[in-house]
């Protein structure tokens, strides 16, 4: 049974599935948004497309106490090869430029849909 247990446990999620699930989560957030997302918190914007997952996580991880994006934060961490903690600042961010979390999530959704259509799952 111990050996057979390995067959029952889920294997690694294919990148295409992980990206689709992240897109679905962002769709949920944008569609179910009633009050200002995360009380209108502001996050660092991004000015490049390379290394985008880590940069997006580095921005969003600085938003605390916002349950609406906690799942997104966890999902993004699965795409980022290194550990990200609050306060990190990537060269991908636009210094002194912040945008609302709601806009960030909306734009992230747009970008991920493009990546999905282009077959860029990593």
């Amino acid at each position: 049974l111990t050996c057979l247990g390995g067959f029952a446990s889920p294997g690694p999620v294919p990148p295409s599935t992980a990206l689709r699930e992240l897109i679905e989560e962002l769709v949920n957030i944008t569609q179910n948004q009633k009050a200002p997302l995360c009380n209108g918190s502001m996050v660092w914007s991004i000015n490049l497309t390379a290394g985008m997952y880590c940069a997006a996580l580095e921005s969003l991880i600085n938003v605390s106490g916002c349950s609406a994006i906690e799942k997104t934060q966890r999902m993004l961490s699965g795409f980022c090869p290194h550990k990200v903690s609050a306060g990190q600042f990537s060269s991908l961010h636009v210094r002194d430029t912040k945008i609302e979390v709601a806009q960030f999530v909306k734009d992230l959704l747009l970008h991920l849909k493009k990546l999905f259509r282009e077959g860029q799952f990593n």
Partner: nanobody, 118 residues
């Protein structure tokens, strides 16, 4: 909120050049396809040119092909339109706008007036 601010318009003689700029803020400019649209006095809106998010693909209306060049600098959140060999028929208000098919991603600037006259 989202802002697109055009600049660089003005009065220029036929055959002259102008460079329009569009400074973007409040959204992730680097992830958007962008474009320029113009409206001549008393006429409807006319698409001029567009560029994809990474800047590698550009598109032009036949009326400006070979004379206008669209470009972008994602590090500066800025879109450009270099206009050469200007003609009287290029006189219009030029608007910077996002160029996305997705509903809800439609953002426009206030426009900048270009007048080509001798």
């Amino acid at each position: 909120g989202v802002q697109l601010l055009e600049s660089g318009g003005g009065l220029v003689q036929p055959g002259g050049s102008l460079r329009l700029s569009c400074a973007a803020s409040g959204f992730i400019f680097a992830w958007y396809d962008m474009g320029w649209v113009r409206q001549a006095p008393g006429k409807g809106l006319e698409w001029v040119s567009s560029i994809n998010d990474k800047g590698g693909k550009t598109y032009y209306a036949d009326s400006v092909k070979g004379r206008f060049t669209i470009s972008r600098d994602n590090s500066k959140n800025t879109l450009y339109l270099q206009m050469n060999s200007l003609r009287a028929e290029d006189t219009a208000v030029y608007y910077c706008a996002t160029a996305e098919d997705e509903p809800g991603y439609d953002y426009w600037g206030q426009g900048t007036l270009v007048t080509v006259s001798s």
